[in-house]
């Protein structure tokens, strides 16, 4: 990862974030969508 | 294998207050990769180090930290190995030394930015 | 908006004792261990010492040292030399979906004697 000259904490960190956003906007959207239906 | 800073200069980036300035930070002696992230933060004259945000190289996502509020904007180019930032609306209070940090782990030499009339 | 208080905010030691600091966070880090240490030299930018709260940097001597998880965290500094006067700043990786991101504590200033 960058020639070896960072750990791979960051990325890992950064890639978990996303994941988290992804679900949130995910689930955010269903939500919204059963809220809608009702 | 380091990070050179440029836009306000080590010896002093003057601005007016209201001003704006753009500060670039290149990456040198080794090639970023998507998940690459350049981070910003700063440092007032005699004060801790303040967090302003990080941008990924690959996608462009960015984040902020909450006292931000817009006046400043993050972007790269991944192609030229570079991250910059844009300072808009500036106060005296933003004077500081102003860093840019791969990964928050490898650090640029800083730019001083000096906002006063 | 998180908190990392950083204590004390300055301490002196003799060449060859220990030094420890310590960072409280409010709330807690990300995962419970992604905190990291840096050292800062006058007119120099910051030096990666420790991430995860525990793993050395790399070129990093291993007089220092770090522990802690959740909200409380320590760095030592053992056998210290003159060269390790400097000031010692935490970093904290938090949740970006409820808080910033990162935040960085107040700072501690060692003197060496």
């Known amino acids: 990862h960058s020639d070896g000259i960072f750990t791979d904490s960051y990325s890992r960190y950064r890639k978990q974030m996303a994941v988290k956003k992804y679900l949130a906007a995910v689930l955010g959207k269903r939500y919204k969508q059963r809220v809608k239906n009702k | 294998q380091q990070l050179e800073q440029s836009g306000g200069g080590a010896e002093g980036g003057l601005v007016k207050p209201g001003g704006s300035l753009k500060l670039s930070c290149k990456a040198s002696?080794?090639?970023?990769?998507?998940?690459?992230?350049i981070c910003w933060v700063r440092q007032a004259p005699g004060k801790g180090l303040e967090w302003i945000g990080c941008?990924?190289?690959?996608?462009?996502?960015?984040d902020y930290a909450n006292w931000v509020n817009g006046r400043f904007t993050l972007s790269r180019d991944i192609d030229q190995s570079t991250g910059c930032l844009q300072l808009n609306s500036l106060t005296d209070a933003d004077t500081a030394m102003y860093y840019c940090?791969?990964?928050?782990?490898?650090w640029g030499q800083g730019t001083l930015v000096t906002v006063s009339s | 908006a998180q908190v990392l208080t950083q204590t004390p905010s300055s301490v002196s030691a003799a060449v060859g004792g220990t030094v420890t600091i310590n960072c409280q966070s409010s709330p807690s880090i990300y995962s419970g261990a992604f905190l990291s240490w840096f050292q800062q030299k006058p007119g120099q930018p910051p030096k990666f010492l420790i991430y995860?709260?525990?793993k050395l940097a790399s070129g990093v001597p291993s007089r220092f040292s770090g522990s802690g998880s959740g909200t409380q965290f320590t760095l030592t500094i053992s056998d210290v030399q003159c060269d390790d006067a400097a000031t010692y700043y935490c970093l904290g990786f938090y949740d970006c979906s409820s808080v910033d991101c990162h935040a960085f504590g107040g700072g501690t200033e060692v003197v060496v004697k």
């Open positions: 941008i990924s190289a690959g996608g462009g996502s960015t």
């Open positions: 995860e709260a525990s």
């Open positions: 002696g080794f090639t970023i990769s998507r998940d690459y992230w």
């Open positions: 940090a791969g990964n928050l782990e490898i």
